[in-house]
Interface confidence: low
């Protein structure tokens, strides 16, 4: 029990979560591709979720996807349509803290 507590303490002591750069707003044209970048770092490595207009982003095969990157996460939308406009938020957590950033796709 003691050793388990010590390990937990060490993890808590060294854990951190930072937003490295605010998300940019994107202005683009119909039919084009837009990318939004969520630049966060942390220990343990954060879990990142994407939201559009406060709702979880649902990936669409070959059109809308997000993936982990060395700097956090990237959301890509291909073949943009008018319904894609709105505000996008990434929410990152390391299990203890939460940071978020918002960008707008015009």
């Amino acid at each position: 029990p003691t050793s388990s507590w010590n390990i937990s303490s060490e993890l808590n002591k060294d854990s951190y979560l930072t937003l490295d750069e605010p998300m940019n707003n994107i202005t683009t044209s119909l039919g084009q591709t837009a990318e939004l970048h969520c630049k966060v770092s942390g220990n343990p490595p954060p879990t990142i979720r994407w939201f559009k207009n406060d709702a979880p982003v649902v990936q669409e095969p070959r059109r809308l996807s997000f993936r982990s990157t060395i700097y956090g996460s990237r959301l890509r939308i291909r073949n943009l349509d008018t319904t894609d406009t709105g505000y996008f938020q990434c929410v990152a957590t390391n299990g203890k803290e939460v940071v978020s950033s918002t960008g707008v796709l015009f």
């Epitope: 979720r49 207009n53 406060d54 709702a55 979880p56 505000y87 950033s101």
Partner: antibody, heavy 117, light 107 residues
Framework: EVQLVESGGGLVQPGGSLRLSCAAS????????IHWVRQAPGKGLEWVAA????????SYADSVKGRFTISADTSKNTAYLQMNSLRAEDTAVYYC??????????WGQGTLVTVSS | DIQMTQSPSSLSASVGDRVTITCRAS??????VAWYQQKPGKAPKLLIY???SLYSGVPSRFSGSRSGTDFTLTISSLQPEDFATYYC?????????FGQGTKVEIK
């Protein structure tokens, strides 16, 4: 503790102006959207306007577009609703609310705006 | 605009009753639906988000569910403090739209 406190309501004549304030505390102001929602006496909830202080993104309901302006002062953690050319149908309790992926998770206590001659 | 059609507009119930309120979205809103409780002279309070997630501090007698574009708020055993007006809201399509409200009154 997250808190939103509205102020600035009152009685105003048709055609007049008012500025509402929403003072936020207990959270990172620039990480959330701030919305204004109003409720006319005995009626339901009506969305009015929103601002995302980090990006400066704003939007308005058609019923107030061109008359109301939403803004935010990030140094004061305060959002504002400037209301011009007020009409009798703008009479309502005005609430500010914080939005997150959970919807409108925190609301202020509301401030009453009465437009009457 | 997305319409959220809420029913009934009012209902009368007794303490201990099971109460169900429904909202139908005019088109898909995924699971991005919240439910709020409002008492006279007070601000709305969040009860349920993402259609079925119970917000922190809300009693477990409140629950939400989704079936396609139909959303339901259920109070399993109505308590005296639950007499209030309830609103649904979709927040999938910006900026979000509210239902008309359901007033729960004492029978």
């Amino acid at each position: 503790e997250v808190q939103l406190v509205e102020s600035g309501g009152g009685l105003v004549q048709p055609g007049g102006s008012l500025r509402l304030s929403c003072a936020a505390s207990g959270f990172t102001f620039t990480s959330y959207g701030i919305h204004w929602v109003r409720q006319a006496p005995g009626k339901g909830l009506e969305w009015v306007a929103a601002i995302y202080p980090h990006s400066g993104f704003t939007s308005y309901a058609d019923s107030v577009k061109g008359r109301f302006t939403i803004s935010a002062d990030t140094s004061k953690n305060t959002a504002y609703l400037q209301m011009n050319s007020l009409r009798a149908e703008d009479t309502a309790v005005y609430y500010c609310a914080r939005t997150s992926y959970r919807g409108f998770d925190y609301w202020g206590q509301g401030t009453l705006v009465t437009v009457s001659s | 605009d997305i319409q959220m059609t809420q029913s009934p507009s009012s209902l009368s119930a007794s303490v201990g009753d099971r109460v169900t309120i429904t909202c139908r979205a005019s088109q898909s809103v995924s699971s991005a639906v919240a439910w709020y409780q409002q008492k006279p002279g007070k601000a709305p309070k969040l009860l349920i988000y993402s259609a079925s997630s119970l917000y922190s501090g809300v009693p477990s007698r409140f629950s939400g569910s989704r079936s396609g574009t139909d959303f339901t708020l259920t109070i399993s055993s109505l308590q005296p403090e639950d007499f209030a007006t309830y609103y649904c809201q979709q927040y999938y399509w910006y900026p979000g739209t509210f239902g008309q409200g359901t007033k729960v009154e004492i029978k």
